[in-house]
């Protein structure tokens, strides 16, 4: 992983890169590489794409050994009509403040979210829009034999319910959190992103989690049953360590992978979880990443194209651990 | 975000009135009612009295004649004045907002002793 | 004086369900009481989970449940999780006032 005194090259020749990729001098200064594009595992030896303005984030300090590519100046966002830059703050409505952060919008209301419960001063509560005013405010409904300034004493019904989804609500914030993008690679570790606001102060912010979607030197057409096209989850034999830059999963997974196809079909994940996973590099240092597990995959049509460069953006949304929405990764 | 905070003396002498402010923010005096509430240590809770949205007070029977619960809607604050204090009267205080006492203070102890 | 009684204690096993109930002294809980619950976990503040009977405040999990069961007030919690060990009280309206259970401290066993 460091740079060590003399340079040791894979190859005598630059190697070739695909269309659209740099040839870039690694983080030593030392060899010709394949610049990692947007998404994809960095390291101090394998820099990010300088030209598409993109840069190895490491996220925490102490996790300086593999990072994900990130742009610096992150995508545009088109919102009602308007293109707003990454990073640039809008109101859309007198009743959300909203920012663009790398292609996603997030909204914070700036009405209060509040719930109000029953009360014997409030038995009906509801929220009222009032002439002249942009938030909705509160309001009691009150029996008639109501007293100026006491509590009322009527029964509360049951059958009422009040306020919005107490899942989404935090203390006014309007928690939003996309879907986990498909993952960077077919086969092979790759990286899987989306952005949420589920944190303390209602932040946009970018998580990353490795994926596997299946292993690169699994034959698994050969396990294909005669007169099938598909499988879609296969057996997987043994339980597996898994391997990142040189670094090895401290335990063993049975994970699920998914299959593949004989009819042009492609098998992607379709319900998910995040799990973190413990990796131990040679030089001893314990590093932790969050990582996608299959639970379900699905067949379809509905396969990238070999030179879609917004495939991770837009491609295949994996579902089934959309915001935990009391934990944080 | 919605917090309330009680503030006051510590320790209060016998005979002396105990004076505790709860400060609110995030929601409006106008909308919600706040209540007082204390716990003696090692025991339960107590609920002393309230100052509901519009104003009106109710409180608990047995310390009518002691307590008075006032707010200015303005500068978001309810004051909570208990009078002849005695040490039994030691206890930490609560302020709370109606509707389902949904949230506190943290409380602020009180000591009351010579 | 109205007396409002809780369990003092009760134990579950995590995944378990438990019903925690609050019986006034002077008749059935019915829904003019605005049976409250509130719950306050070692070192934090306390919290309201339920108001008006049944109705959850916004970050009370789907698992705790506010009723009325055999005329008192009642909190059921399923699937119960360790951090759901805490001391909960009930409190009661009577048309001039409040009173508060003197409390119950769940356990949560493992």
């Known amino acids: 992983q460091d740079c060590s005194a003399q340079c040791q090259c894979a190859a005598e020749a630059a190697p070739h890169c695909p269309a659209g990729v740099s040839l870039v001098l690694d983080g030593c200064g030392c060899c010709r590489v394949c610049a990692k594009q947007l998404g994809e595992l960095c390291t101090e030896r394998d820099p990010c794409d300088p030209h598409k303005g993109l840069f190895c984030d490491f996220g925490s300090p102490a996790n300086r050994k593999i990072g994900v590519c990130t742009a610096k100046d992150g995508a545009p966002c088109v919102f009602g009509g308007s293109v707003y830059r990454s990073g640039e703050s809008f109101q859309s409505s007198c009743k959300y403040q909203c920012t663009c952060l790398d292609g996603a919008v997030g909204c914070v209301p700036l009405c209060s979210m509040d719930v109000r419960l029953p009360s014997p001063d409030c038995p009906f509560p509801r929220r009222v829009k009032l002439p002249g005013k942009c938030c909705e405010e509160w309001v009691c409904d009150e029996p008639k034999d109501r007293t100026a300034v006491g509590p009322a004493l009527a029964a509360y019904r049951l059958e009422d319910t009040f306020g919005p989804d107490p899942t989404m609500m935090r203390a006014n914030c309007l928690v939003q959190t996309t879907e986990w993008s498909a993952c960077s690679k077919t086969c092979g570790m790759g990286i899987s992103t989306r952005v949420t606001n589920d944190n303390t102060f209602c932040r946009l912010e970018k998580q990353s989690r490795l994926c596997m979607v299946r292993p690169c030197e699994a034959d698994l057409e050969e396990n294909i049953k005669k007169g099938k096209k598909c499988i879609r989850t296969p057996k997987i034999a043994k339980p597996v360590k898994f391997e990142l830059s040189g670094c090895t999963s401290v335990k063993t997974y049975r994970a699920k992978f998914c299959g593949v196809c004989t009819d042009g079909r492609c098998c992607t994940p379709h319900r998910t979880t995040t799990l973190p996973v413990e990796f131990k590099c040679p030089d001893g240092e314990i590093m932790k990443k969050n990582m996608m597990f299959i639970k379900t995959c699905a067949c379809h049509y509905n396969c990238p194209g070999d030179n879609d460069i917004f495939e991770s953006l837009y491609y295949r949304k994996m579902y089934g651990d959309m915001a935990h929405h009391h934990h944080h990764h | 975000e919605v917090t309330l905070k009680e503030s006051g003396p510590v320790l209060v002498k016998p005979t002396e009135t105990l004076t505790l402010t709860c400060t609110v923010s995030?929601?409006?005096?106008?909308?919600?009612?706040v209540h007082w509430i204390r716990q003696p240590p090692g025991k339960g809770l107590e609920w002393l009295g309230v100052i509901w949205r519009r104003g009106g007070t109710d409180y608990n029977a047995a310390f009518m004649s002691r307590l008075t619960i006032s707010k200015d809607t303005s500068k978001s604050q309810v004051v909570f004045t208990m009078t002849n204090m005695d040490p039994v009267d030691t206890a930490t205080y609560y302020c709370?907002?109606?509707?389902?006492?949904?949230?506190w203070g943290q409380g602020t102890t009180v000591t009351v002793s010579s | 004086e109205t007396v409002v009684t809780q369990e003092p204690s009760l134990t579950v096993s995590p995944g378990g369900t438990v019903t925690l109930t609050c019986r006034s002294s002077i008749g059935a809980v019915t829904t003019s009481n605005y049976a409250n619950w509130v719950q306050q976990k070692p070192g934090q503040a306390f919290r309201g989970l339920i108001g008006?009977?049944?109705n959850r405040a916004p970050w009370t999990p789907a698992r705790f449940s506010g009723s009325l069961l055999g005329g008192k007030a009642a909190l059921t919690l399923s699937g119960v999780q360790p951090e759901d060990e805490a001391e909960y009280y009930c409190a009661l309206w009577y048309s001039t006032h409040y009173v508060f259970g003197g409390g119950t401290k769940l356990t949560v066993l493992g």
């Open positions: 995030g929601f409006s005096l106008s909308t919600f009612g």
């Open positions: 008006g009977t049944s």
């Open positions: 709370a907002r109606d509707g389902g006492f949904d949230y």
